[in-house]
Interface confidence: medium
Amino acid sequence: QEEGQVEGQDEDIPPITCVQNGLRYHDRDVWKPEPCRICVCDNGKVLCDDVICDETKNCPGAEVPEGECCPVCPDGSESPTDQETTGVEGPKGDTGPRGPRGPAGPPGRDGIPGQPGLPGPPGPPGPPGPPGLGGNFAP
């Protein structure tokens, strides 16, 4: 996973970027500051949400891999039902209210890829503006 740029002390912080924990992120970058939290730079403002894990029923041996947030079934231990639905995204939660847009500037690097279930970073800017950050994120 790509890291944000280290923020120089004497560098300008323009509206095209977000700074979190000393790292600079470009407009529409998506990153995980910690395993169970996901953030996006939305026009100069950092918006974060908790990662919501799918239930791991019918999988008694589910474990959380190191550095990850959600438990996964060990290979081959899923029930037939689980195998049929492995990799299928569950229903999305309700979209949160659209927040006010801040300024944007031209995107820098491509956004950091999201976890499975999250949309990847959009392409070059153009009307309409970017959607607001959803209420929940599935892993």
């Epitope: 300008d12 323009p14 509206p15 095209i16 026009n43 100069g44 403002k45 006010p100 847009r101 801040g102 300024p103 944007a104 500037g105 031209p106 800017p125 009307p127 309409p128 503006g129």
Partner: antibody, heavy 119, light 107 residues
Amino acid sequence: EVQLQQSGAELARPGGSVKLSCKASGYSFTAYWMQWLRQSPGRGLEWIGVIYPGDGDARYTQKFQGKATLTADKSSSTAYMQLSSLASEDSAVYYCARWFHHDYVMDYWGQGTTVTVSS
Amino acid sequence: DIQLTQSPKSMSMSVGERVTLSCKASENVGTYVSWYQQRPEQSPKLLIYGASNRCTGVPDRFTGSGSGTDFTLTISSVQAEDLADYHCGQIYNYPLTFGAGTKLEIK
């Protein structure tokens, strides 16, 4: 109709300070960043900084850090720029301009405020 | 900082003539260039954004083109009301920077 109405001309002494205002109307003041720029014959258009009225987040270009202070009053939909330690080279026309993030442009500009620094 | 160089500094044209203004960036700025028209004693007015997108209400005789480091504003048939300074500006990186402008005079 979007409008940005700036305060009148200012005459200041070297070392003094002035506070310029930019009253916004016709749009949601707290949802758009406000850019500040200046224009003088010798230097053309220069970008000073930007403020997000929704939370007061202000950001400056390095040249104007310590020189300009940006604030905003949500109740009156007015953005302010205070300029301190004025010198003759700060004589210029100062503009506020709305930043339209959709297209990455300054789409509406105030009419400008002329600041003259003279002893 | 990114430098923008505009040429010519000034030009005098007759009504109906075709005008071409140039703006060169010191480094690649993609298509993140805007053009502004500033009539005498007025504030800048946005004409073109994203190098080639005409702003709402701007006559179609104004056309922007270019990418990377070379940009052009063309007025296909200049009118008397086009008397103004024309500035290019880049928003590819901060600080935002602008060219020194081209003064268009009408004969």
